[in-house]
């Protein structure tokens, strides 16, 4: 008789999760000389220790502290790019602009990007069938708590001018419930961060509206200003041209507004 197993509303752990985490760690530490000292087996042990045998609705930031210790990494604090609901373009940008970093360009972000994981209370099993959904089941699940923890630390590390890429095609360009809106915005340190500069990415080719005037952007400006951080906003009307101009800034067409 098969043992009863909790059915959650979200997808189960990504197949070959342990192997994927270990392989990504090895790859990352090979590419980034400053992280060569990292012992990837210990990284996996720490990752595993954070959620294995724990109820997947009762995970805390404390559970991830050993992993956070092992993944401690110094990125230039004035070269941080945050993003919300526009991950692919943000990653394309930092692949070209190599001196800027998204969270997923750090070891811990790279390890977990696009993966799902959870365990079961009091067993050593990884649950490949289902994991808790943030809305339908619980917010203190292994994946959500991980991203909350690393996002908080990433925002806390930022300084000078911090950039954020926002999706202008969404009904809420700035969403208070996103990781950016609920975690990162509130963990920028006013004593270190001078300005938050939002880049609003337009979707339609003929969209010439000033999305920096959007009510949700005004809401973001208000939140940031109350935290004694300056706010600025730019429209990126042509994301394709924007990326092209990052690659080839000398191109004559790159002097006009993009």
């Amino acid at each position: 008789v098969p043992r009863w197993r909790q059915q959650w509303s979200g997808p189960g752990t990504t197949k070959r999760f342990p192997e994927t985490v270990l392989a990504r760690c090895v790859k990352y530490t090979e590419i980034h000389p400053e992280m060569r000292h990292v012992d990837c087996q210990s990284v996996w042990d720490a990752f595993k220790g954070a959620f294995i045998s724990k109820h997947p609705c009762n995970i805390t930031e404390e559970d991830y502290q050993p992993l956070m210790k092992l993944g401690t990494q110094t990125v230039p604090c004035n070269k941080i790019l945050l993003w919300s609901r526009i991950k692919d373009l943000a990653h394309q940008f930092t692949q070209v602009q190599r001196d800027m970093f998204t969270l997923e360009d750090t070891l811990l972000g790279y390890l977990a990007d696009d993966l799902t994981w959870c365990g079961e209370f009091n067993t050593s099993k990884i649950n490949y069938q289902s994991c808790p959904d943030w809305r339908k089941d619980c917010s203190n699940n292994p994946v959500s708590v991980f991203w909350k923890t690393v996002s908080r630390r990433f925002a806390e590390a930022a300084c000078d001018v911090v950039h954020v890429m926002l999706n202008g095609s969404r009904s809420k360009i700035f969403d208070k419930n996103s990781t950016f809106g609920s975690v990162e915005v509130h963990n920028l340190q006013p004593e270190k961060v001078q300005t938050l500069e939002a880049w609003v990415i337009h979707g339609g080719r003929e969209d010439s509206r000033d999305l920096c005037q959007d009510p949700t952007i005004k809401e973001l400006e208000s939140i940031i200003s109350k935290r004694n951080i300056q706010f600025s906003c730019k429209n990126i009307y042509r994301p394709d041209k924007f990326l092209q101009c990052v690659k080839n800034p000398e191109d004559s067409s790159c002097t006009s507004e993009i």
Partner: antibody, heavy 116, light 107 residues
Framework: QVPLHQSGPELIKPGASLKISCKAS????????MNWVRQRPGKGLEWIGW????????KYNGKFMGKATLTADKSSGTAYMQLSSLTSEDSAVYFC?????????WGQGTSVTVSS | DIVMTQFHNFMSTSVGDRVNINCKAS??????VAWYQQKPGQSPKLLIY???TRHTGVPDRFTGSGSGTDFTLTISNVQSEDLADYFC?????????FGSGTKLEIK
């Protein structure tokens, strides 16, 4: 193999304090949990606590609070354990050992004899 | 504190035999258990962690099994160099605790 080299044997008087060192020979020192373990003659192993040199975080076995103090020097890759108010009960071999999910590398041990 | 009980202080075996060394935790530690070998006059050596993962360089005749509260270290095809004390340890809860040890004697 990651050798951990501990300071030599100590003969110490009751009531005195003592500092034992444990030097790591690899660059992973800052990113390892450094444990200290006691083994009294003919007895088992007792975990004293650990230090994580990367951020100087420590965790102690309540039994050794006030008795042992763990510190680390990142620049030299050395962990230290200070033992205070020593009594004959503290006579033992003290090991440093690296690791958090099982202690994968151990020092050779430091023998401490407390006697007047 | 979690108590790790090794019921046999001594076990006697012959070269080539298979021996099981047992360890019982006073509460569920899932698989957060390590096994160590300590030869006379030496430091302990890690054999097994996560209850069943063999540490680098450990011969495959050493096998760990169990979960929850009951754990076993199995040595198959015992060799004369296996004469040692064997300790289990839990790292599920603080403080970490060790079993009292099982001395393996070779007949």
């Amino acid at each position: 193999q990651v050798p951990l080299h501990q300071s030599g044997p100590e003969l110490i008087k009751p009531g005195a304090s003592l500092k034992i060192s444990c030097k790591a020979s690899d660059s992973a020192f800052n990113n390892s949990w450094m444990n200290w373990v006691r083994q009294r003659p003919g007895k088992g192993l007792e975990w004293i606590g650990w230090i994580y040199p990367g951020d100087d975080d420590t965790k102690y076995n309540g039994k050794f609070m006030g008795k042992a103090t763990l510190t680390a020097d990142k620049s030299s890759g050395t962990a230290y354990m200070q033992l205070s108010s020593l009594t004959s009960e503290d006579s033992a071999v003290y090991f440093c050992a690296r690791g958090r999910w099982g202690m994968d590398y151990w020092g050779q041990g430091t023998s401490v004899t407390v006697s007047s | 504190d979690i108590v790790m009980t090794q019921f046999h202080n001594f076990m006697s075996t012959s070269v080539g035999d298979r021996v099981n060394i047992n360890c019982k935790a006073s509460q569920n530690v899932v698989t957060a258990v390590a096994w160590y070998q300590q030869k006379p006059g030496q430091s302990p050596k890690l054999l097994i962690y996560w209850a069943s993962t063999r540490h680098t360089g450990v011969p495959d005749r050493f096998t760990g099994s169990g979960s929850g509260t009951d754990f076993t270290l199995t040595i198959s095809n015992v060799q004369s160099e296996d004469l040692a004390d064997y300790f289990c340890q839990q790292y599920s809860n603080y403080p970490f605790t060790f079993g009292s040890g099982t001395k393996l004697e070779i007949k």
